[in-house]
Amino acid sequence: MNSFNYTTPDYGHYDDKDTLDLNTPVDKTSNTLRVPDILALVIFAVVFLVGVLGNALVVWVTAFEAKRTINAIWFLNLAVADFLSCLALPILFTSIVQHHHWPFGGAACSILPSLILLNMYASILLLATISADRFLLVFKPIWCQNFRGAGLAWIACAVAWGLALLLTIPSFLYRVVREEYFPPKVLCGVDYSHDKRRERAVAIVRLVLGFLWPLLTLTICYTFILLRTWSRRATRSTKTLKVVVAVVASFFIFWLPYQVTGIMMSFLEPSSPTFLLLNKLDSLCVSFAYINCCINPIIYVVAGQGFQGRLRKSLPSLLRNVLTEESVVRESKSFTRSTVDTMAQKTQAV
């Protein structure tokens, strides 16, 4: 019996969770979709609309500033990661509507469901980079004055993207289409070819590198930052706290079900009742993780200091406001006004 995680996108589906027992039905044969699949479709639709529009707006707003403003570089990269993932949603949506039938071919099966994993790794690595930046602004302001520039920020983002691509490769490689006969359909999923150890290894690496390790390091990082900022009366900011909590918490909250079900399924036998139950929830877990792709613009842009006012103003006349807004750049250090302000305010915008 092969182990096949069919798609919803990667965890098989959209990713590689759905391990399919070949002697069990690939789905209920009724014409109606399961409740978890219906919920997933609703979430996908909302995420697509909000995510595409929101991230497109963020990209538009930040693209003009990204050559000079370091914060814009971070937000631009996060928005690009989210926007890319959102582009796969119509395909994933269609597949679920068709009871996980995948008529889009092998290349699409390898690439599209892997986008959410690329997003996961890119987002968490970019968040780690942003957190490091925040940390340095608080604890090494002099270093920042000398070395913190747009060039270094772009290099950090390039490294984050490179690592994200590298970490997405395993799911990409194991993703295959498979013809099913009872009922007739083509499934897209992850095939580990009987190798349960390999499946577990991929799930564990994903859990550790995409969730547990970042959770630990970001928690420590922000604990130090908040302790420092709270210790100075002038910088006690509830907005700061809200932004930090939203930034970190949203990522981990929305990825938690996916990660938990993924690790559980890698340790369960495909015929076990728990496995079959989790398998039915796979699309829903993936859709829940996808919420990250539309919530980031709201958190990082609307709530972020320096971008809140700009976004509000730019909605009626986006181009005019963005293009005419003044930025002060110090030639020697690629500094921006927001950088100077941030340090002057002792990281009020953490």
Partner: antibody, heavy 116, light 107 residues
């Protein structure tokens, strides 16, 4: 046109092992579809036994899983059904059939009689 | 496993007559149903798949329909070569199962 032809020993004794062959002509068994074994008992009841797909993936009827194996020889374009130990209850006519959307092509069948 | 209950088990009819055979599925099979014809020599041929789609080369007098969980095969005007055994088969999940068959005989 796709044609399937089954062949086998005809008569075997209980507890013996045996192999039935399905030779496919006019179509490559590795191009697509699944290649199935189905049997029909003396009372005319039909039972799906299992398949081997174009990619080599195998699926069995859970009721028979431990007793049979399905293999193939791609160079000869043949599918095989092996029994490790037959009983008189395995007396039936054995068909191979192609599955794409349901079973669209069937062989003529080969009769297997298990008797001491 | 899904049980396919086929009726009648045997049927006598005359040439030119219209006959209907039915098959009831114990669970939802969403139209994943075929009708098969088995001639006296044992050869099996598929007539209909997806409940109502006629296979190429099958005469138009054969038709398939569905009403809920009940599937029907109708022969509008019997001809001599139609007297044979007929089986329904679902392929909605594992394992696919067959109806018990209907023996169509000349009256």
């Amino acid at each position: 046109d796709v044609q399937l032809q089954e062949s086998g020993p005809g008569l075997v004794k209980p507890s013996q092992s045996l192999s039935l062959t399905c030779t496919v002509t006019g179509y490559s068994i590795t191009s697509d579809s699944a290649w199935n074994w189905i049997r029909q008992f003396p009372g005319n009841k039909l039972e799906w036994m299992g398949y081997i797909s174009y990619s080599g993936r195998i699926s069995y009827n859970p009721s028979l899983k431990s007793r049979i194996s399905i293999t193939r020889d791609t160079s000869k374009n043949q599918i095989f059904l092996q029994f490790n130990s037959v009983t008189t209850e395995d007396t039936a006519k054995y068909y191979c059939a192609r599955a794409s959307i349901g079973f669209d092509y069937w062989g003529q069948g080969t009769t297997l009689t298990v008797s001491s | 496993d899904i049980q396919m209950t086929q009726s009648p088990s045997s049927l006598s009819a005359s040439l030119g007559e219209k006959v209907s055979l039915t098959c009831r599925a114990s669970q939802e099979i969403s139209g994943y149903l075929s009708w098969l014809q088995q001639k006296p020599d044992g050869s099996i041929k598929r007539l209909i798949y997806a409940a109502s789609t006629l296979d190429s080369g099958v005469p138009k007098r054969f038709s398939g329909s569905r009403s809920g969980s009940v599937y029907s095969l109708t022969i509008s005007s019997l001809e001599s070569e139609d007297f044979a055994d007929y089986y329904c088969l679902h392929y909605a999940n594992y394992p696919p199962t067959f109806g018990g068959g209907t023996k169509l005989e000349i009256r």
